[in-house]
């Protein structure tokens, strides 16, 4: 149980293209065929103008035309929906496939990839039907770009919706040593963070988010996974104590703004018969800015490193109400391996703490849309898009 963390199954609310809570000013495009196929006509199920956004230039062979949606705040985007240009039966244009790029800061753009590294998403087969695509893994983004594709020179048009929820954790990135491979007699268990969207340098992953923040918790047997067609160890990121003579794995966490931290929850494996143990303890330090020193004595939380019940579980580490925008936590080994599947935080934004990232004046002027001001997880009166067998999701 990861009480306090978001439930990805419920993070599937329409984010405002169709119902227009995303204003026209937050939709932009690389180009438009005409004013009647401009950015503002890219809303799912909309029949305004000529019935969709259509780029001015061809999308084959170069895939450079895009439709950009600014969500104004960080969201977890779990699902996207696309349509072509129907226009009361007059439109024939649609995109059979597309790519997504996303950004949390407006500067660095990441390509969305599925769990096997594929970027291309199957799109529409006709101009009118809505095709929903479950994003596995989901993306934490403020800006999302759709890049329609074609396999020959042809016209493509697009209408879209995004589904997800507000990213309430406020976590911008975590830094951690690269996850390692466990050699068991019968199988290689790859305990790497396979969806990490930051940088990797030397032994370090930094500047991104990945499997430790995707809402998916691992099973009791770390060789198994809830995902289909993935390799053993997929749900976990793990480190061998033999790589860390210090006796701990060190991680850093960067948040969107100054926060008061109550609790950190770490979902850990405890299959001690194969060497995975809960941490023996956790130490965390805080700082308010990137160039500042870590403040005072770390918060220390001793754990049993329990050999007992081998089931995976979430451990809750009290953080004592300390204030910061950066955390550095050391997880102490109590056995041969540390295996984590999820790390989340319960925190409160410090009053009058404005977004510190990205800095002004990159963002367009104007107040944020009012529909997100309440910090609600789900928009009022909406039902999340169901994820069920037989549903029209890819």
């Amino acid at each position: 149980d990861m009480k306090g963390h978001f439930d990805p199954a419920k993070c599937r609310y329409a984010l405002g293209m169709q119902d227009r809570t995303i204003p026209d000013s937050d939709i932009s495009v690389s180009s438009s065929w005409s004013d009647s196929t401009a950015a503002r006509h890219s809303r799912l199920e909309s029949s305004d103008g000529d019935g969709a956004w259509c780029p001015a230039g061809p999308v084959f062979p170069k895939e450079e035309e895009y439709l950009q949606v600014d969500l104004r705040r960080l969201h977890l985007v779990a699902l996207v929906g696309t349509q072509g240009r129907h226009a009361g039966g007059l439109g024939k244009e649609f995109s059979r496939s597309y790519r997504l790029r996303y950004s949390r800061d407006g500067r660095r753009w990441m390509d969305w990839k599925d769990r096997w590294g594929q970027e291309v998403i199957s799109g529409n087969e006709d101009p009118g039907g809505v095709v929903l695509k479950d994003l596995g893994p989901p993306m934490v983004a403020r800006l999302v770009r759709f890049y329609p594709r074609a396999d020959r020179v042809m016209s493509v048009c697009l209408r879209v919706e995004l589904y997800g929820c507000l990213w309430r954790d406020g976590l911008l990135s975590y830094t951690a040593p690269v996850g390692q491979t466990m050699q068991l007699s019968e199988v290689m268990v790859h305990l790497n963070d396979s969806t990490y969207d930051g940088y990797t340098a030397g032994g370090l992953q930094y500047g991104g988010l990945g499997q430790l923040a995707d809402g998916v918790v691992g099973l009791d047997d770390f060789r198994q996974s809830q995902e289909l067609r993935v390799w053993p160890g997929y749900d976990y990121v793990g480190w061998s104590n033999q790589s860390f003579p210090t006796g701990y794995v060190e991680m850093e966490f960067e948040f969107d703004r100054l926060r008061t931290f109550q609790t950190m929850q770490v979902h850990c494996n405890n299959m001690h018969t194969l060497g995975a143990r809960l941490p023996g303890g956790v130490e965390c330090r805080f700082k308010r800015g990137p160039a500042m020193a870590w403040e005072g004595e770390p918060v220390r939380h001793a754990l049993g490193g329990s050999l007992g019940d081998p089931r995976a579980r979430a451990i809750s580490v009290p953080l004592g109400g300390h204030v910061g925008r950066f955390l550095q936590c050391r997880f102490l080994f109590a056995g041969p391996w540390l295996l984590f599947s999820e790390i989340s935080f319960i925190s409160d934004v410090v009053n009058d703490s404005s977004d510190t990232f990205p800095p002004a004046p990159w963002w367009p002027p104007g107040p944020p849309p009012t529909n997100f001001s309440s910090l609600e997880l789900e928009p009022r009166g909406q039902q999340p898009v169901a994820k069920a067998e037989g549903s029209p999701t890819a």
């Epitope: 040593p177 491979t181 790859h190 990797t200 340098a201 030397g202 032994g203 790589s243 210090t246």
Partner: antibody, heavy 121, light 107 residues
């Protein structure tokens, strides 16, 4: 171009101090574990010490107290401060960058060309 | 501190021979082992990390195996450019000792 260039090696008298530099280009030093390794003439490789991306330092037991590793991020330069030098410290000194393979384990993928330190009266 | 012991210290072999070099750690180091090749007057070159992962550009005739305390580097068919000295290294996030080296010479 990604490279490491050591400098500062020279002939020095026993008991004196010397600081070696290792300047990185094409990448940021502070995103890697960086190591100093030496090799006496006709001998094998000998690990001296390591500095982590979090500025934690580790030393071989024989190097503790006499050798200090540091870095200046603004100059993208790694340093090895050597004090109370002895004849047996005569060696080629290398800096090296630790990278990870597909299995998440470290190896020294990038090395400098080495700089020769000769301790002699 | 962990010690790494390599054997043999030298080996004479001919082109086409299979050569095996062993490295023993004074205590278990799991998979935290790398192998290097060094030629006279040159810096070492990484061959293998994580016991068996070949570094970029390393020919497939090189292979690594082992776990715990005993490790092996194998050259399946020795080539002229393989005559060199080989080192193992325990390389964790911290102290990183090398083995004493094995010189592969022309018979």
């Amino acid at each position: 171009q990604v490279q490491l260039v050591e400098s500062g090696g020279r002939v020095v008298q026993p008991g004196r101090s010397l600081r070696l530099s290792c300047t990185a280009s094409g990448f940021s030093l502070n995103r890697y574990y960086m190591l100093w390794v030496r090799q006496a003439p006709g001998k094998g490789l000998e690990w001296i010490g390591t500095i982590s991306y979090g500025d934690t330092t580790y030393y071989a037991s024989w190097a503790k107290g006499r050798f200090t590793i540091s870095r200046d991020n603004s100059k993208n330069t790694l340093y090895l401060q050597m004090n109370s030098l002895r004849a047996e410290d005569t060696a080629v000194y290398y800096c090296a960058r630790a990278d990870t393979g597909d299995n998440g384990y470290l190896g020294l993928q990038l090395w400098g060309q080495g700089t020769l330190v000769t301790v002699s009266s | 501190d962990i010690q790494m012991t390599q054997s043999p210290s030298s080996v004479s072999a001919s082109v086409g021979d299979r050569v095996t070099i062993t490295c023993q750690a004074s205590q278990s180091i799991g998979s935290v082992l790398a192998w290097y090749q060094q030629k006279p007057g040159k810096a070492p070159k990484l061959l293998i990390s994580g016991v068996f992962d070949l570094a970029s550009g390393v020919p497939s005739r090189f292979s690594g195996s082992g776990s715990g305390t005993d490790f092996t580097l194998t050259i399946s068919s020795l080539q002229p450019e393989d005559f060199a000295t080989y080192y193992c290294q325990y390389i964790p996030y911290g102290s990183s000792p090398f083995g004493g080296g094995t010189k592969v010479e022309i018979k």
